[in-house]
């Protein structure tokens, strides 16, 4: 089926991975489709097979090299096409001239750890993963803390408008279990979006000292 609503979205992780999602209403689950990448100034071509992730969407990763290798730059253009098999031939279902540094989505931050915890505050640090050195300090972060009895969606967002890989959470309740997540976004790129949220870090504040005001 080709008359359904289609969407083709790809992001570059700033190092060696382009991740793509192709969705099409009314498409058959067993349709064989792939993403083909044709760079304008590189010697390689790359293809990945689109695999189903839901009823009407497929995803794949174009792995361009070792995870931390810088495979594309701000001047690269990669023509990306969705090709689906129709009988004996491949049909172009979507096409774009992909500018990697206009379409960034970094990997989720990793290595979250509690640096110091008290009754009312907690200092947490993290690291960014597979992020290009091109960004220098031009990154921002969002963080959120899950309190007891609340959902992640209810958690207020804390914005860090600079490359700061730590946060000091204040006004916490003593002897209480919390969870914390962080995500990162480069300042560069018209279609750039937030990374996925990090894996949650669970921590517990210290109990208040007996006989003292809290």
């Amino acid at each position: 089926a080709v008359n359904g609503t289609s969407q083709f979205t790809c992001f570059y992780n700033s190092r060696a991975n382009i991740s793509c999602v192709w969705s099409q209403d009314g498409a058959l689950q067993d349709t064989s489709c792939q993403v083909h990448a044709w760079p304008d100034r590189r010697r390689w071509n790359q293809t990945c097979e689109l695999l189903p992730v839901s009823q009407a969407s497929w995803a794949c990763n174009l792995i361009l090299g070792a995870p931390d290798s810088q495979k594309l730059t701000t001047v690269d253009i990669v023509t990306l096409r969705v090709l689906c098999r129709e009988g004996v031939r491949w049909r172009v279902m979507a096409i774009q001239d992909f500018k990697p540094f206009e379409n960034l989505r970094l990997m989720a931050p990793i290595s979250l750890q509690v640096v110091h915890v008290e009754t009312h505050r907690c200092n947490i640090s993290w690291e960014i993963s597979q992020a290009s050195h091109y960004f220098e300090r031009h990154l921002e972060f969002e963080a959120r803390t899950l309190s007891p009895g609340h959902t992640w969606e209810e958690a207020p967002l804390l914005t860090l408008k600079q490359k700061q890989e730590w946060i000091c959470l204040e006004t916490l309740t003593p002897d209480t279990q919390y969870e914390f997540q962080v995500r990162v976004k480069p300042l560069q790129g018209e279609f750039t979006t937030w990374s996925p949220w990090s894996q949650p870090l669970a921590f517990r504040t210290k109990p208040a000292a007996l006989g003292k005001d809290t």
Epitope: S6, F8, R91, A94, I95, Q96, D97, F98
Partner: nanobody
Framework: QVQLVESGGGLVQPGGSLGLSCAAS????????MSWVRQAPGKGLEWVSS????????HYADSVKGRFTISRDNAKNTLYLQMNSLKPEDTAVYYC???????????????????RGPGTQVTVSS
């Protein structure tokens, strides 16, 4: 704000040629796919041709394939349509259109545009 302004239309004899231009402003031109569509008198909009942001991919309606060429000059923020071997049935108002993203979908190329210019009249007649 996004602005698209077509030019180059006119009266031409069958078999003749004409070149249309579309000057774009108000957006990062080379980040977006573009297209040409046309509307003949008393008819609906008909998709003519599409081009990717860097001009590396192009598609054409069967009715114009081999006669029309779409191109773009990103340094000048301008989209072009070179029309050769014109026929009376090419008579229409020609519009340039901006897609809402860098992607277009060849099976349904008329879908996904968000801005269109005021158009330029092309008349093919002897």
């Amino acid at each position: 704000q996004v602005q698209l302004v077509e030019s180059g239309g006119g009266l031409v004899q069958p078999g003749g040629s004409l070149g249309l231009s579309c000057a774009a402003s108000g957006f990062t031109f080379d980040n977006y796919a573009m297209s040409w569509v046309r509307q003949a008198p008393g008819k609906g909009l008909e998709w003519v041709s599409s081009i990717t942001g860097a001009g590396r991919g192009t598609h054409y309606a069967d009715s114009v394939k081999g006669r029309f060429t779409i191109s773009r000059d990103n340094a000048k923020n301008t989209l072009y349509l070179q029309m050769n071997s014109l026929k009376p049935e090419d008579t229409a108002v020609y519009y340039c259109a901006k897609y809402s993203s860098s992607t277009y979908y060849p099976p349904t190329p008329a879908r996904g545009t968000d801005y269109r210019g005021p158009g330029t009249q092309v008349t093919v007649s002897s």
